[in-house]
């Protein structure tokens, strides 16, 4: 079988939802010593980066300026050490937002409810779209989808304090082109007194895993790595 290197990790820096005409940054974290990284878009080569010096860097950033619907879709990356290529990374869905119009988000029976009550969000957008998306701030990877001609509903069922937080919705023109976000609706859930202290308030900053953890190897790290390699050989 053909030998391959471990697959790299692909991430979007700050967010995978990029407003049109703004810049997206994707990070591909591979291995120290990789001489080339390739970013693929919908199966075709999109961009190449050759880190300098390769032995000191464990990944690269790919910049996608001027975001639009032509650049929205599925990205992956690979890297090369010598003549040996890695496996392909997982796929990353890059979405362009702020297309066309702004939907309206409402909640029934209202934004202040008691634990155990049934809550339904309604997202309305008058321009032609059939798919709607509901996102909770700080949980942007947990996208709920619903369908409707001009309005979609998102039944939440009986809510708990874990449902507390700020919600926004989008209209979607395809999987990767979304409308402007709605104004946020803050859901306040009271009750469940014994659980209240356990329910963390959602962060208002972007999802913490949407960051690029690329590092430059220092001389000390290199010495430690060499020492570890030598020790492993001695143990064998």
């Amino acid at each position: 079988p053909k030998q391959t290197l471990p697959k790299p990790i692909i991430r979007a820096e700050s967010t995978y939802m990029v407003p049109k005409e703004k810049q997206a940054t994707l990070c591909c974290q591979g291995s120290y010593g990789a001489v080339e990284y390739q970013l693929h878009f919908e199966g075709s080569l999109f961009a190449v980066e050759r880190p300098k010096p390769p032995e000191r860097i464990n990944g690269v950033k790919f910049h996608i300026p001027d975001m639009n619907s032509r650049k929205a879709g599925r990205y992956s990356c690979i890297y090369r050490v010598g003549e040996l290529w890695s496996e392909r990374s997982d796929l990353l869905d890059l979405v362009v937002t702020e297309m066309y119009d702004t939907p309206t988000l409402s909640v029934h029976p209202g934004p202040e409810v008691t634990s155990g009550e049934k809550v339904t969000f309604y997202c309305r957008l008058d321009t032609a779209t059939s798919m709607f998306l509901l996102l909770k701030e700080g949980r942007s990877r947990d996208v709920q989808r619903s369908y409707g001609k001009v309005q979609a509903e998102f039944p939440m069922g009986p809510v708990t304090t874990a449902h507390r937080g700020s919600y926004r919705c989008f209209g979607s023109y395809n999987n990767y082109a979304w409308s402007f976000p709605s104004e946020p609706v803050k859901l306040l859930v009271t009750g469940d007194i014994e659980n209240t202290s356990l329910a963390p308030t959602d962060p208002t900053f972007p999802d913490s895993w949407d960051t690029c953890l690329l590092t430059r190897e220092t001389g000390l790290q290199k010495d430690l790595a060499l020492w570890d390699h030598t020790a492993q050989n001695l143990l064998r």
Epitope: F41, S44, L45, F46, A47, V48, E49, R50, K52, V60, K61, F62, H63, I64, P65, D66, R70, K71
Partner: nanobody, 126 residues
């Protein structure tokens, strides 16, 4: 706004050489990644060669070893030196730019480019 103007196209015999130039207006040239694409009659536009801000290059397999891309930041110009030309190299050649860019990304996909020239025709025939 960036404007790109290609020149240097023309008719040449198989095995011959040509040098295409692409002059860019504006002060953003040094921060732009540049590329050359071509479109033959009745065919899709295809990638030829690209160069990063720092001068790293990437070529389509079909032109590797025959074409060389280079840039002169002082002159706001990118070049495509074409040698050992073949009949299948006949096409309209387009210069393109990604502005702004950071790091040393080399862009290969046409969707990455946000500025395009009008093109210059290269004809290779005996």
């Amino acid at each position: 706004e960036v404007q790109l103007v290609e020149s240097g196209g023309g008719e040449v015999q198989p095995g011959g050489s040509l040098r295409l130039s692409c002059a860019a207006s504006g002060r953003t040239f040094a921060s732009a990644a540049m590329g050359w694409f071509r479109q033959a009659p009745g065919k899709e536009r295809e990638f030829v060669a690209a160069i990063s801000r720092s001068g790293d290059t990437y070529y389509a397999d079909s032109v590797k070893g025959r074409f060389t891309i280079s840039r002169d930041n002082a002159k706001n110009t990118v070049y495509l030196q074409m040698s050992s030309l073949r009949a299948e190299d006949t096409a309209v050649y387009y210069c393109a730019a990604v502005v702004p860019t950071y790091g040393n990304n080399i862009y290969v996909h046409s969707a990455a480019y946000n500025y395009w020239g009008q093109g210059t025709l290269v004809t290779v025939k005996p």
